[in-house]
């Protein structure tokens, strides 16, 4: 079986995918769908997946959803949400992705790959 991808490589690939879907993008991602904002300080991968998994039929983020699934150790399904959700705060998918991207770059620079 193929050897597992090193965490640093996987994180870099996720960052690159988020860059791909946001570069020079002014039109709303996923038809302007709104998702729950999350607390970025802990458990970011599962929390991000729990939020984005509720967006369906948006090809632009399907790869991101799959990649986040690889980072999250437990199964995530639509409608599920942990305490990491920012209470009653919804933002557009595009802003969610940008905020996530900023945070993941910070983690990468700090060497926090898991």
């Amino acid at each position: 079986s193929p050897s597992p991808v090193p965490p640093s490589t996987a994180l870099k690939e996720l960052i690159e995918e988020l860059v791909n879907i946001t570069q020079n993008q002014k039109a709303p991602l996923c038809n302007g769908s709104m998702v729950w904002s999350i607390n970025l300080t802990a458990g970011v991968y599962c929390a991000a997946l729990e939020s984005l998994i509720n967006v369906s039929g948006c090809s632009a983020i399907e790869k991101t959803q799959r990649m986040l699934n690889g980072f999250c150790p437990h199964k995530v399904s639509a409608g599920q949400f942990s305490s990491l959700r920012v209470r009653d705060t919804k933002i557009e998918v595009a802003q969610f992705v940008k905020d996530l991207l900023v945070h993941l770059k910070k983690l990468f620079r700090e060497g926090q790959f898991n």
Epitope: N24, K26, K98, R109
Partner: antibody, heavy 126, light 109 residues
């Protein structure tokens, strides 16, 4: 002071090669996406290609007329951008500018090439 | 390959409003950027992300975008605004940059 200084231009015969360099200072070069833009004599600006920052994948993209002949690379330890030009044609004659593309940006928005070098002239002629 | 289309020239008298257009199929979803280039000089960014003005650029420069058309407006054009203006954007993938053919702005002194 934010600055970009190109070098390496000159006269070369058709089919020949040339490597341009662009030395950056005054900003965090490793964070920046960098582009090359050229301008043929009396003509408009033409996008040549760009390279992302290493953290954003370090990937390159090229305009159709130069794809397969030109290669953009970077050395973040030297704060330097490069343009390797092979199989040069007379129509590659131009002033070549390097330009920043998202200096210090932390995400994928494309802020425009807000810092430019003074340009270096490449002449391809027999 | 993707193209941005600009008028070759625009002429105004000093104090008049100059409008330079740029059309491209991807502009509804991709931002436009505008550069000013004076003779023998490197380009200078005057508008980014359709309508934002970098610091140091006079307020008379503004930008807008609607559908497949982006517009650079110079309200109360001055003689020193005489230059070539280029719109810049990317194709729909965001991966490939493109410039319009450029518009020569003449401010009739």
């Amino acid at each position: 002071e934010v600055q970009l200084v190109e070098s390496g231009g000159g006269l070369v015969k058709p089919g020949g090669s040339l490597r341009l360099s662009c030395a950056a200072s005054g900003f965090t070069f490793s964070n920046a996406w960098m582009s090359w833009v050229r301008q043929a004599p009396g003509k408009g600006l033409e996008w040549v290609g760009r390279i992302r920052s290493e953290i954003d994948g370090g990937t390159t993209n090229y305009a159709a007329p130069v794809k397969g002949r030109f290669t953009i690379s970077r050395d973040d330890s030297k704060n330097t951008l490069y343009l390797q030009m092979n199989s040069l044609k007379t129509e590659d004659t131009a002033v070549y500018y390097c330009a920043t593309d998202q200096v210090g940006a932390y995400y994928g928005d494309y802020y425009g090439m807000d810092v430019w070098g003074q340009g270096t002239t490449v002449t391809v002629s027999s | 390959s993707y193209e941005l289309t600009q008028p070759p020239s625009v002429s105004v008298s000093p104090g008049q409003t100059a409008r330079i257009t740029c059309s491209g199929d991807a502009l509804p979803e991709k931002y436009a950027y505008w550069y000013q280039q004076k003779s023998g000089q490197a380009p200078v960014l005057v508008i980014y992300e359709d309508s934002k003005r970098p610091s140091g650029i006079p307020e008379r420069f503004s930008g807008s975008s609607s559908g497949t058309m982006a517009t650079l407006t110079i309200s109360g054009a001055q003689v020193e605004d005489e230059a070539d203006y280029y719109c810049h954007s990317t194709d729909s993938s965001g991966n490939h940059g493109v410039f319009g053919g450029g518009t020569k702005l003449t401010v009739l002194g």
